[in-house]
């Protein structure tokens, strides 16, 4: 998939509760930054079915955001 | 249950205008954001222009930007798409589109709308040289 550009929020609104879990391919985390003061979940689906936006206060976005920062710390 | 039905298309000569309209129902029209999108004969559906729901931030691919708007009729549920200039590349299936989950993605200088969930059955659009 084309590159992010941080110079608006990605996510134009509030987010999906919740995809299915064997549709997900990669899981991307965008923290609050200059450019958009929220963070975003975004969902890349498997067989180039897109994206999507996670609300980030579902549970499943703070079930990822929780396995994502378990990772990288 | 979710409906979004286009309206507006037709002929028009090379730099003609029309505006196209797409009427939503069966869900809370201020919580989802909606695009346009277009397939042209032989080619993939593009994303043309997208209208956020949480601040009403527009956006354009580049092959639009400049001759296309995009507008939002909350009171009545209606997203227009007034388009002018028109170029006989410009003729295609014109779609409209919308999603909570959606996204703009920026790539080679222009904005893609994705993540769209409920989609309409297309008004075509002619543009004749």
């Known amino acids: 998939f084309p590159m992010f550009k941080r110079g608006r929020c990605l996510c134009i609104g509030p987010g999906v509760k919740a995809v299915k879990v064997a549709d997900i391919e990669k899981a991307s985390i965008m923290y609050p930054s200059n450019n958009c003061d929220k963070i975003e979940v975004i969902i890349t689906l498997k067989e180039n079915k897109g994206q999507r936006c996670l609300n980030p206060k579902s549970k499943q976005a703070r079930l990822i955001i929780k396995k994502v920062e378990r990772k990288n710390f | 249950e979710v409906q979004l039905v286009e309206s507006g298309g037709g002929l028009v000569q090379a730099g003609g205008s029309l505006r196209l309209s797409c009427a939503a129902s069966?869900?809370?029209?201020?919580?989802?954001?909606i695009g346009w999108f277009r397939q042209a004969p032989g080619k993939e559906r593009e994303g043309i222009s997208c209208i956020s729901s949480s601040d009403g931030s527009t956006y354009y691919a580049d092959s639009v930007k400049g001759r296309f708007t995009i507008s939002s009729d909350n009171a009545k549920n209606t997203v227009y798409l007034q388009m002018n200039s028109l170029k006989p590349e410009d003729t295609a299936v014109y779609y409209c589109a919308a999603g909570l989950g959606a996204l703009v993605r920026y790539y080679s200088g222009s904005y893609y709308c994705d993540g769209m969930d409920y989609w309409g059955k297309g008004t075509l659009v002619t543009v004749s040289s």
């Open positions: 069966g869900f809370t029209f201020d919580d989802y954001p």
